[in-house]
């Protein structure tokens, strides 16, 4: 069925209409839209009370609604693909006519968690209970329905129409009937405010056709924000009743003449307006003409007024409303300026902090200052930033370049720096030699020594350690430890065996690789290599070979 029975309540600058009819939310919105409105908003407790009043009016006219729990669509919807958001008062829903999210809500129960389906909100009315201002209709969300299938218990909908202003209802000074026709095609004979552009038809008399006079008026904007009918004096006056009928149609006082005629008057502090019926305060500020936080200030002799704005705001072109002053236009800050309602604030770029001479000044943050350095080793402060550096033998590492990582010179890009064995240490390295060889005074080369079946010669003393210089010596083998049966480290080299610059054979005794003294308490394996090969030495015999084949991917075994 379509929408039929309707009720109307006009208040402030809006009218609300309630309609019965089992329509989907889209059909209901379309119905409101055709007359220039939208499904109603309920953005505050006050608005909820207006909507409740129009629903109460509708329910008084409706004979019998089919469900005890009836639902009426309002203009709160969540589009397909938009998820429920529990952190917001409107839970991710928004008003169909647009407008900002508002803090007021009145949800019936916890909302169904969904994203895929479009969801719509209706007001839930328990028809077994009287509608009380203290018990406002709850919001119920659900599917939006479809033509012919509006959804369970949907009995109607509420529309809202907004206007630039309202006229007071016409005052009748004698018997008669007023019929208002609104721009949204509703006719009513009792409105507490009548929207701009409404027509009023006044039929005077007591129903006796011979005595009936008709008047036609339009609610017009007489001056900015001033709306009236353009009528003068009370309508349908009758000497028979004088002031006794509806106070003669007067807003405040009614004065009768001896001949049955009468005039309207006003109480002290008020004046009679051009319609000769309505009274307005002599104080022009009493009608609160100023908006947006502006204060009304009376002019001399109380005749006119001006609006005054709080600090940080200025009057707009209407001279009635306050708008924020954008203080950032004057560039009051050294770096970033953020305009705020009624003011502004200065902010500093990353790497700077508030401080220095002058308002809104910024000064460099010394990231390298004691206790706040983000660098593992060296830190250099720069204007607005910083950079990290590492001691010799370390390189910058980490995603943000603040960490230092030991350079393993034994497997470095320039190749190993030692002629034979290489022991990496934190920030440095040491060279060593195979059995039967001794470390030369340069700490890098190996020279033939007395034949020995002992372990390889350990690292040189500190003063003999290899200098950290680039080298073009090609890399040979890197040994990688494994655990022996007794849990002792056992060298298992993972690259090609070394070539030695002498014909002397490598002894067949297994090599025991020793962690050099002064190295950290972790096993570091040597790298076995040599720059040139004069002749190929014999393959070592026996159990633990100190040499293994190269990885098939061409890489060295990891430490």
């Amino acid at each position: 069925t379509g929408a039929d029975t309707e009720a109307v309540v006009c208040v402030g600058t809006a009218c609300y209409t309630a309609h019965s009819g089992k329509l989907s939310a889209a059909e209901a919105q379309n119905h409101c839209n055709q007359n220039g409105g939208n499904l109603a908003t309920v953005k505050s407790k006050e608005e909820a009370q207006h909507v409740q009043r129009v629903l109460a009016q509708l329910l008084r006219r409706e004979a019998a609604l089919t469900a005890r729990m009836s639902k009426f669509w309002i203009g709160l919807q969540r589009e397909k693909g938009k998820c429920l958001d529990p952190s917001l008062p409107l839970k991710g829903f928004s008003w169909v006519g647009g407008g900002e999210d508002t803090p007021y809500s009145n949800w019936h129960k916890e909302l169904r968690n969904s994203c895929i389906s479009k969801r719509c909100v209706s007001l839930l009315l328990d028809l077994s209970q009287p509608l009380l201002p203290s018990r406002l209709p709850k919001w119920s969300e659900g599917p939006c329905g479809s033509p012919g299938s509006p959804g369970s218990n949907i009995e109607g909908f509420v529309c809202k129409f907004s206007f630039k202003g309202m006229c007071r209802p016409l005052a009748l000074g004698g018997p008669g009937q007023v019929t208002y026709t609104t721009p949204f095609q509703t006719t009513s004979s009792s409105l507490e405010a009548v929207p701009f552009a409404s027509a009023a038809n006044v039929a005077c008399g007591e129903g006796d056709k011979d005595e009936t006079q008709s008047h036609y008026f339009l609610c017009k904007e007489k001056a900015p924000d001033v709306f009236d009918w353009g009528s003068s004096g009370p309508l349908c006056v009758s000497p028979k009743y004088g002031c006794n009928f509806n106070n003669g149609g007067c807003h405040q006082d009614c004065f009768e003449g001896g001949d049955g005629s009468f005039l309207c008057g006003c109480r002290p502090g008020f004046r009679l307006l051009d319609d000769l019926v309505t009274c307005a305060s002599r104080n022009p500020c009493s009608s609160s003409p100023c908006r947006g936080g502006a204060t009304c200030v009376l002019g001399p002799h109380g005749k006119n007024y001006t609006c005054r704005c709080p600090q940080g705001y200025q009057l707009d072109s209407s001279q009635l409303d306050c708008v924020d002053v954008d203080e950032c236009q004057d560039s009051p800050c050294a770096q970033e300026c953020v305009n705020t309602p009624g003011g502004f604030r200065c902010e500093c770029w990353v790497g700077y902090e508030p401080g220095g001479p002058g308002e809104g000044a910024c000064q460099d943050v010394d990231e390298c200052a004691l206790g706040r350095s983000p660098c593992a080793q060296g830190c250099t402060n720069t204007d607005g930033s910083f950079h990290c550096s590492c001691e010799e033998g370390y390189v910058l590492a980490g995603e943000d370049g603040t960490q230092c990582q030991d350079v393993d010179e034994c497997v470095g890009p320039g190749g190993p720096l030692c002629d034979s064995l290489c022991f990496n240490t934190q920030g440095s390295f040491h060279c060593g030699c195979l059995p039967g060889w001794v470390l030369a005074p340069n700490g890098v080369s190996c020279t033939m020594g007395p034949v020995s079946l002992g372990p390889p010669s350990g690292p040189p003393d500190e003063e003999d350690k290899g200098e950290k210089e680039g080298s073009t010596v090609p890399r040979a083998a890197t040994a990688s430890p494994t655990r022996g049966p007794e849990g002792t480290p056992k060298a298992t080299p993972t690259t090609s065996r070394p070539s030695l610059s002498s014909d002397a054979p490598i002894t067949s005794a297994p090599l025991k690789m020793l962690a050099p003294s002064g190295s950290p308490g972790v096993w570091r394996e040597p790298s076995i290599h040599h720059a040139t090969a004069a002749s190929g030495p014999q393959e070592p015999a026996g159990g633990d070979s100190s040499v293994a084949t190269q990885n098939n991917d061409g890489t060295d075994g990891q430490k």
Partner: antibody
Framework: QVQLVQSGAEMVKPGASVKISCKAS????????MHWVRQTPVYGLEWIGG????????AYNQNFKGRVTMTRDTSISTAYMELSRLTSDDTAVYYC?????????????WGQGTLVTVSS | EIVLTQSPATLSLSPGERATLSCRAS???????LHWYQQKSGASPRLLIY???NLAFGIPARFSGSGSGTDYTLTISSLEAEDVAVYYC?????????FGGGTKVEIK
């Protein structure tokens, strides 16, 4: 507790269709949306689409539009995902999943997965 | 559609080390709609962190998440053997939902 139990592995020929089921238990079936995600070695995890069991409304990934159909049978708390015109690229593990009482599409519950192999 | 790029592809760390996984979006994502999943070998994905920084039920406190806009991070403060898995980020800011390519975390 919430459980999502999927139908068994499928071997299908190129050009054919496959229909996988996902039976829900431990909650009111119409309360939570049901989504389908697949996993392949090449493309990783891909969202196929989802269905709102209360209304039957669906949302599909455009990449599967025209080939995928999601349905549900509320009487047996089961969701279905049918994919047609299969190619070898559709060989994957298919999961049904939903976000239970969590918000913002954080998929809290997952089925055990259904391996679909497309091979001639 | 929003593309999520995860790095590194593989992360090899020793037990007790801190793991930092990155997820970068091709355009801004609401922090409410960015989630992390853990998938162990042969298992279904498991929700780890939802809405950028909230631990899912039963997830140990060594996992944490942070980020906003286009850059998000999953951190494992002290890696344990049981954390060996592939970790995925996922976002929603309109259909389709998308997942990152994953970061494989392994023990050195």
């Amino acid at each position: 507790q919430v459980q999502l139990v999927q139908s068994g592995a499928e071997m299908v020929k190129p050009g054919a269709s496959v229909k996988i089921s996902c039976k829900a238990s431990g909650y009111t079936f119409t309360d939570y949306e049901m989504h389908w995600v697949r996993q392949t070695p090449v493309y990783g995890l891909e969202w196929i689409g989802g269905i709102d069991p209360e209304t039957g409304d669906t949302a599909y990934n455009q990449n599967f539009k025209g080939r995928v159909t999601m349905t549900r049978d509320t009487s047996i708390s089961t969701a279905y995902m049918e994919l047609s015109r299969l190619t070898s690229d559709d060989t994957a593990v298919y999961y049904c999943t939903n976000y239970g009482n969590l918000y913002y599409y954080a998929m809290d519950y997952w089925g055990q997965g259904t391996l679909v192999t497309v091979s001639s | 559609e929003i593309v999520l790029t995860q790095s590194p592809a593989t992360l090899s760390l020793s037990p007790g080390e801190r793991a930092t996984l990155s997820c970068r979006a091709s355009s801004s994502v609401s922090s409410s709609y960015l989630h992390w999943y853990q998938q162990k070998s042969g298992a279904s994905p498991r929700l780890l962190i939802y809405s950028t920084s909230n631990l899912a039920f039963g997830i140990p406190a060594r996992f944490s998440g942070s980020g906003s806009g286009t850059d998000y991070t999953l951190t494992i403060s002290s890696l344990e053997a049981e954390d060996v898995a592939v970790y995925y980020c996922q976002q929603y800011s309109g259909y389709p939902l998308t997942f990152g390519g994953g970061t494989k975390v392994e023990i050195k």
